[in-house]
């Protein structure tokens, strides 16, 4: 059951009127512009910023008073500032939307350490992970290690955004006190909606009488 | 008042091509989304195109799909439809019609008196 | 693509009479039905849309009703300016007419 609250001074649930929130949106996906209504009765108009106003066509895009325009598969014509209109007893109301593409491009993935990894037992493992891609993409890092079912790493995760063509992911595993069980193959994966790439290092663990 | 004159209708051979225009006054035609729609001889209404009023986005039903295309000028007040590949199942009246905003959905509210086009050897 | 079927595609009527035309969709509508009235050498003129909504300016004599897949249209206290040819659209998913009702005087 959806229950419509009526309010002829409010006719969309939530108004942006003022600064747009942001809707992350991907090309080819569904896109919801949600100015939902407080009365299915509210004709509600949708208009791309500078000087078009979108058909809604029962088909790619839909109006549903209690979700909004729902886009079926967006494109870059939907890029930008979206406002949806309304006008209830002679006052026009408006609530802003501000699309921003996210792309799934994964320009780079590395392990900034050396090739296998040799390491004393007991001491510490810190393994770097860096992922680039452009500006306008957001990624999923994670790993697989020898003895990941006891949860042994402990993961940092940082952004850099200071470079003005790329994004710059990093994921720092740390294990402390590295026993013989960890020696093996350590793998960072890096996820962007369908895109995906991995890098790996081995990882050997010697006692101080082998060095 | 709303006006819509369409224009350009003729006499062409099948696999011809022609051009209708919709020249229209009386409301911001720069604000609305606008139509093509004919009537076919035996009295049917077919819609054959749409364009919104910024002219980013068209539609059109399979059935001229390819071989139609709607386009306007915001600055002349005018409306076109670029008709190409013309077969004699074309042979209609062709409507312009605006576009208005009725519960969300668009219906065509204002239409022109027509143009004909005859598709026939 | 949604199918309209509407009926009858003639009536005869007298004046002051009513008539009822319908229009079927094969799938529902969600009330985004629209009528009008087409007169020889002219534009279809909109009466009423959203399935029972009049445009301003049209007489209270003409209605409209429905949901779903079934909606009507109807004239009561018929005259002679009426005498025209009547057609349905539904307007949810692209646009699609119905095929017309020719009303002609009995």
């Known amino acids: 059951i959806y229950i419509f609250i009526s309010d002829t001074g409010r006719p969309f649930v939530e108004m942006y009127s003022e600064i747009p929130e942001i809707i992350h949106m991907t090309e080819g996906r569904e896109l919801v512009i949600p100015c939902r209504v407080t009365s299915p009765n509210i004709t509600v108009t949708l208009k791309k910023f500078p000087l078009d106003t979108l058909i809604p066509d029962g088909k790619r895009i839909i109006w549903d008073s209690r979700k909004g325009f729902i886009i079926s598969n967006a494109t870059y014509k939907e890029i930008g500032l979206l406002t949806c209109e309304a006008t209830v007893n002679g006052h026009l109301y408006k609530t802003n939307y501000l699309t921003h593409r996210q792309t799934n491009t994964i320009i780079d993935v590395q392990i900034s350490t050396p090739r296998p990894v040799k390491l004393l037992r007991g001491h510490t493992l810190v393994l770097n992970c860096t992922a680039t891609t452009p500006l306008n993409t957001r990624v999923q890092m994670t790993w697989s290690y020898p003895d990941e079912k006891n949860k042994r790493a402990s993961v940092r995760r940082r952004i850099d955004q200071s470079n003005s063509h790329a994004n710059i992911f990093y994921s720092v595993l740390t294990i402390d006190k590295m026993q013989n069980k960890d020696k093996g193959l350590y793998t960072c994966r890096v996820r962007s909606g369908p895109s995906f790439k991995s890098v790996n290092t081995s990882v050997h663990i010697y006692d101080k009488a082998f060095i | 008042e709303v006006q819509l004159v369409e224009s350009g209708g003729d006499l062409v051979k099948p696999g011809g091509s022609l051009k209708l225009s919709c020249a229209a006054s009386g409301f911001t035609f720069s604000s609305s989304g606008m139509s093509w729609v004919r009537q076919t001889p035996d009295k049917r209404l077919e819609w054959v195109a749409t364009?919104?009023?910024?002219?980013?986005?068209?539609y059109y039903p399979d059935s001229v799909k390819g071989r139609f295309t709607i386009s306007r000028d915001n600055a002349k007040n005018t409306l076109y439809l670029q008709m190409s590949s013309l077969k004699s199942e074309d042979t209609a009246m062709f409507y312009c019609?605006?576009?208005?905003?009725?519960?969300?959905?668009?219906?065509?509210?204002?239409w022109g008196q027509g143009t004909s086009v005859t598709v026939s050897s | 693509d949604i199918q309209m079927t509407q009926s009858p595609s003639s009536l005869s009527a007298s004046l002051g009479g009513k008539v009822t035309i319908t229009c079927t969709t094969s799938q529902d509508s969600n009330n985004y039905i629209a009528w009008y009235q087409h007169k020889p050498g002219k534009g279809p003129r909109l009466l009423i849309h959203y399935a029972s909504t009049l445009q301003p300016g049209i007489p209270s004599r003409f209605s409209g009703s429905g949901s779903g897949r079934d909606y009507s249209f109807s004239i009561s206290n018929l005259e002679p300016e009426d005498i025209a040819t009547y057609f349905c659209?539904?307007?949810?998913?692209?646009?699609?007419f119905g095929g017309g009702t020719k009303l002609e005087l009995k």
């Open positions: 659209l539904q307007y949810d998913y692209l646009w699609t």
């Open positions: 019609a605006r576009l208005g905003n009725y519960g969300g959905y668009y219906a065509m509210d204002y």
């Open positions: 364009i919104t009023s910024g002219g980013s986005y068209t």
